[in-house]
Structure formats: structure tokens, C-alpha cells
Interface confidence: low
């Protein structure tokens, strides 16, 4: 498996998608795990619903959520309020019995927010927001491993 890089900005959210063959993995639950070391085990972070037919329901473990489109064949993981310690290697897995097939190897990169007010002189002022509520992000930037990218201007 090649490694796919997903980049997010610190404090924001990152959506990771793992496509798979829906027929080959029919009836299988999925999981998102974090690779511990180069050859270490992959530690489970969150898995889809215990009932495969309900895999479309979002399941959450802390700031990480998972949902599975079993018909379309896309596993989606959302990492909210991304922090530097979230950076690292992960896997999307398809579970069968005590075994797990790797659907995709993922490298999560966490980029400092270049629009941080400390870097922008007097640019930033308190904004006006008329309501503050939680929501799920639906955005990420995915490229090949060789392309390091920063999704916001640095205002250096």
C-alpha cells in the first residue's frame, strides 16, 4: 500500500477518506487505527457500528469520528480540532474475525495556522459571530506523499 497524505491546519478539522471495493468488503465492519512505530501494532482509535447495516451512523471516540458508506465503498474519518500530537501514520482497516485488511495507509500532517493573529500585525480584530455552535467539517486536502502543501497564506 502506498501512503496517502492528508493535511490539516491546527485547530481546524480534517476529513480522511478511504475508498474500497464494496463487494469485496461486503458485511465487514471498518476501523481507524494509529500506527505505533514503524513496525509496531496499529492501535484502534474508532470503529464503525457493531451492526454492519448501521455502519452509516457516525461513531465517535473523543475528537475522532467514523462513518461508512457501505454501498458507495467509502470509509470517512473526521478528526476535529486537529492538534500537533495528531500527526502520524494511521490505517483504515476492514475487519473480519480477528483479522484486519488494510484499506489505506494514511499520513496525517498537522500544519500550524499561518493566518495566526500573532503573525499578522494588527490584521486580526474580534469578529462578530451571532451564534457559536458545534459542527462537523467536510474538508481536507489530500495529495501524494511527496507534495507538502500548506492550505493557508502565511502572512509572514
Amino acid at each position: 500500500h502506498n501512503t496517502t497524505v492528508f493535511q490539516g491546519v491546527e485547530g481546524q478539522s480534517l476529513q480522511v477518506s478511504c475508498p474500497y471495493d464494496s463487494m469485496k468488503h461486503w458485511g465487514r465492519r471498518k476501523a481507524w487505527c494509529r500506527q505505533l512505530g514503524e513496525k509496531g501494532p496499529c492501535q484502534r482509535v474508532v470503529s464503525t457500528h457493531n451492526l454492519w447495516l448501521l455502519s452509516f451512523l457516525r461513531r465517535r471516540n473523543g475528537s475522532t469520528a467514523i462513518t461508512d458508506d457501505t454501498l458507495g465503498g467509502t470509509l470517512t474519518i473526521t478528526l476535529r480540532n486537529l492538534q500537533p500530537h495528531d500527526a502520524g501514520f494511521y490505517q483504515c482497516q476492514s475487519l473480519h474475525g480477528s483479522e484486519a485488511d488494510t484499506l489505506r495507509k494514511v499520513l496525517v500532517e498537522v500544519l500550524a495556522d499561518p493566518l495566526d493573529h500573532r503573525d499578522a500585525g494588527d490584521l486580526w480584530v474580534p469578529g462578530e459571530s451571532e451564534s457559536f455552535e458545534d459542527a462537523h467539517v467536510e474538508h481536507s486536502i489530500s495529495r501524494s506523499l511527496l507534495e507538502g502543501e500548506i492550505p493557508f497564506p502565511p502572512t509572514s
Epitope: G127, E149, S156
Partner: antibody, heavy 118, light 112 residues
Framework: EVQLVESGGGLVQPGGSLRLSCAAS????????MSWVRQAPGKGLEWVSV??????????GYNPSVKGRFTISRDNSKNTLYLQMNSLRAEDTAVYYC?????????WGQGTLVTVSS | DIVMTQTPLSLPVTPGEPASISCQSS???????????LNWYLQKPGQSPQLLIY???TRASGVPDRFSGSGSGTDFTLKISRVEAEDVGVYYC?????????FGQGTKVEIK
Amino acid sequence: EVQLVESGGGLVQPGGSLRLSCAASGFTFTDFYMSWVRQAPGKGLEWVSVIRNKANAYTAGYNPSVKGRFTISRDNSKNTLYLQMNSLRAEDTAVYYCARLTYGFDYWGQGTLVTVSS
Amino acid sequence: DIVMTQTPLSLPVTPGEPASISCQSSKSLLHSTGKTYLNWYLQKPGQSPQLLIYWMSTRASGVPDRFSGSGSGTDFTLKISRVEAEDVGVYYCQQFLEYPFTFGQGTKVEIK
């Protein structure tokens, strides 16, 4: 599908005020920076203002040409971005676009025309 | 403010032929990260602008591969390998390095 729809433009006298709205859909509004960009008739594009996302406390930034006169805000319960424009001048006459800001202005609304004239 | 200067301001093109637009910035847009904060937009007649290229050379989602961006810290080029009728409109470069963000004055591409 991401959609941005502006409204609120119109004719206003110099020194007057106007409030523009931008209704957003198709993405999680609170997670994105949003911006206003304007285009005077027959002219080029000028960035006006930006408001950051929830993770950045919705802090705002302005082009010096409008700072102190314009205020950007957002109502996250309505997925709506606003631009309150005060002390309007003839040179503020333009089509005002609302745009989502990621690694560029990746989605734009259709624009709303603001005409400042006596 | 960083000043963006585009040339030419008008570009008559022939469908099927290549076309090239230049953009120059008054300051290097190359950041210490190695990224160059230069974007290209196309505004088709009667439409809103659309993002074509970001970080100088990365095509935005859905943009045909006949569009390519290149350049150095201050000199940039947008190339269309084979112009199609739907490519007409005004092309803008924009620096994304510093506030306030600034755009070039635009290059109007039209069919000969």
C-alpha cells in the same frame, strides 16, 4: 454541492449604510474562513475582508481601504455571512462577492451590486 | 501592499493553439515553507471568478490539465496548452502571501 448566494445590494447615497448577506450551503460553515471580494464596474478584483472559523474565534481582517467602515460577521445558526458597510463612498460602488477561503478563494457567490451615488 | 502586474492586458487567441499569460509581483511570493503563494483565477463573461491554480502550479479541483502554472519567486506564467472556446474570459493572478491580498489587473482572453 457548495453554494454561496449573496443579497442586500442596491442603491445608496454617499455616507449611507448597507448590509450584505451571503447564504452558504453544501459545507460545514463554522469550519471555514469566509471572505468578501469586490469588483468595481469594468474593473478588477479587490479583496475586502475575511472572517476566520470557529477554531480561530471568528477573528476578522480588513483591507485598509475599508477598515473602520466595514464590519464582517457571521451567523452560524443560519450559515450566513454578512458585511455591514457604513460611511459608503462612490469608490465603494462594485459587485460584492462572498467567497470561501481555503488555499485560495475556492468557491464564489454570484455577487450583489452595490451602487453608491447621490 | 504587494503589487501584481499582468501582461498582456488583452490576448487574442486561436482555438487549438497555445496561450500564455504573465504575472509579476513586486515582492517574492516564495515562502520559507517552499510554497509560492500565487493563485490564478478565470472570470468567464457574466460569471463569478473561479479558482484555476493555487500555490503557483497546483490545479484546483475540476480544472482541465490544459491549464498549467509555473514561475519563480516574482515572475509567473499561466499556460493553456490548447485553447478552447470556453476558455475566454478575464484571467487574474493573485498573491496569497500577505495581507491585503492583491490581484493583477486582469488579462482578457478572446477568440480571434
